[in-house]
């Protein structure tokens, strides 16, 4: 199980079941809790455990987070008291109120969404709930909408990329991992169309290529051919010194 750096889990042996006070347990004791033990706790005890884990900044595994979330049928109203990444595993339906959802999704933007793989059901249910919360109708997004979505913006399907390229492309640049097929096609079409914020490929400079670095792998031959060749050569030469940057396909 994941834990604080250099810290090993102490065997619990039922220590969660009835300690005088869960918050009195050490991070080392809290670290190793097995799901089976959490399943036997009352909802109130699980809440106490979640709050204690946050207070002591105990790093939890995905399985532990999922297990805790499953037992927190009615999470505490003070979301700030919960481990940030735990929110990713909670059902957003529990925060569908117009005020509750803004608190929930504002916190979610600070969480590490990539703890959940793109296809995970927990992640898939977050985006539609976030869009509903922020009042997004259709596929047209404002800069504020994209900011409010945080890491969930990386999950927006191609139709959003097509309609909101100006505000969304600069965000997709920094998305970890590859975009899906639908997103790639929409991004390619938007870049080829030459609209804002990058303009026509024929006018791109080395700094445009720098700004586009995360999207370079999606550029097709038609786009690459449109970029002034001197710019491509200069950029390739510069970026070859930094192998962490992904190159456009030749």
């Amino acid at each position: 199980l994941a834990g604080e750096t250099g810290q090993e889990a102490a065997p619990l042996d039922g220590v969660l079941a009835n300690p005088p006070n869960i918050s009195s347990l050490s991070p080392r004791q809290l670290l190793g809790f097995p799901c089976a033990e959490v399943s036997g706790l009352s909802t109130e005890r699980v809440r106490e455990l979640a709050v204690a884990l946050a207070q002591k900044n105990v790093k939890l595994s995905t399985e532990q987070l999922r297990c805790l979330a499953h037992r927190l049928s009615e999470p505490p109203e003070d979301l700030d008291a919960l481990p940030l990444d735990l929110l990713l595993f909670l059902n957003p339906d529990a925060f569908s109120g117009p005020q509750a959802c803004t608190r929930f999704f504002s916190r979610i933007t600070k969480a590490n969404v990539d703890l959940l793989p793109r296809g995970a059901p927990e992640r898939q249910r977050l985006l539609p709930a976030a869009l509903a919360c922020w009042g997004v109708r259709g596929s047209l997004l404002s800069e504020a909408d994209v900011r409010a979505l945080g890491g969930l913006a990386c999950d927006l399907p191609g139709r959003f990329v097509a309609e909101s390229a100006e505000v969304l492309l600069p965000r997709l640049v920094s998305c970890p991992g590859p975009l899906d097929q639908d997103q790639q096609e929409a991004a390619r079409a938007a870049l080829q169309g030459g609209g804002p914020p990058y303009g026509p490929p024929s006018t791109w400079s080395v700094s445009t290529m720098d700004a586009l670095r995360g999207l370079l792998p999606v550029l097709g031959q038609p786009i690459i051919r449109s970029i002034p060749q001197g710019i491509v050569a200069a950029w390739r030469q510069r970026s070859s010194r930094d192998p962490s940057w992904r190159q456009p396909e030749r």
């Epitope: 109203e77 003070d78 529990a94 569908s96 109120g97 117009p98 005020q99 803004t102 608190r103």
Partner: antibody, heavy 122, light 112 residues
Framework: QIQLVQSGPELKKPGETVKISCKAS????????MNWVKQAPGKGLKWMGW????????SYADDFKGRFAFSLETSASTAYLQINNLKNEDMATYFC???????????????WGAGTTVTVSS | DVLMTQTPLSLPVSLGDQASISCRSS???????????LEWYLQKPGQSPKLLIY???NRFSGVPDRFSGSGSGTDFTLKISRVEAEDLGFYYC?????????FGGGTKLEIK
């Protein structure tokens, strides 16, 4: 204990501006939306709109768009209702009410201020 | 907007009688989460309103069990099984599912 304390009665002339305050205590102010409700003399309750105390974003019912403004002073746990260019039809008692929207069951206006009476007279 | 219509406007009752107030909406107001946020409030003269019932049929804490709410779709009812003197006042239904939220016109419960 949890309460909403509203500012005192106001006597204003048509065309003037009034600003009513609603001070919350006993709970975390930013956890609950603040709603405003109008009650004209001898009439029923009319929902004016609400302000999200977490984001500061107001939402107004159609009849209250334009001259009405909701605002916050979060550090003082206080919500405000300002009415500009007062008209005779604004003469009413204005209530602030906290709306709980936790989980999927507990949605309601559970705590109300005592109301602020605004009299408009030339 | 969802229009809420209450009947009757005035309801004269004898203490100990059952009282029933109806609230009809111009359209269904089920929230996207599947719940119907229909509430009932009582306002006594010179006081602010107080919550009685939330989510159609749930009694708020401290509300006597002689109050009950029911209904679905566009038709809702508040029942008071045995009216007591402290129950007199104005009753309002309220939909809190879709902004703009809306109150019914109110029903005055008075002594016959």
């Amino acid at each position: 204990q949890i309460q909403l304390v509203q500012s005192g009665p106001e006597l204003k002339k048509p065309g003037e501006t009034v600003k009513i305050s609603c001070k919350a205590s006993g709970y975390t102010f930013t956890h609950y939306g603040m709603n405003w409700v109008k009650q004209a003399p001898g009439k029923g309750l009319k929902w004016m709109g609400w302000i999200n105390t977490y984001t500061g974003e107001p939402s107004y019912a159609d009849d209250f768009k334009g001259r009405f403004a909701f605002s916050l002073e979060t550090s003082a746990s206080t919500a405000y209702l300002q009415i500009n260019n007062l008209k005779n039809e604004d003469m009413a008692t204005y209530f602030c009410a906290r709306r709980r929207d936790y989980g999927t069951s507990h949605w309601y206006l559970d705590v109300w201020g005592a109301g602020t009476t605004v009299t408009v007279s030339s | 907007d969802v229009l809420m219509t209450q009947t009757p406007l005035s309801l004269p009752v004898s203490l100990g009688d059952q009282a029933s107030i109806s609230c009809r909406s111009s359209q269904s107001f089920v929230h996207s989460n599947g719940n119907t946020y229909l509430e009932w409030y009582l306002q006594k003269p010179g006081q602010s309103p107080k919550l009685l019932i939330y989510k159609v049929s749930n009694r708020f804490s401290g509300v006597p069990d002689r109050f009950s709410g029911s209904g679905s779709g566009t038709d809702f009812t508040l029942k008071i099984s045995r009216v007591e003197a402290e129950d007199l006042g104005f009753y309002y239904c309220f939909q809190g599912s879709h902004v703009p939220y809306t109150f019914g016109g109110g029903t005055k419960l008075e002594i016959k």
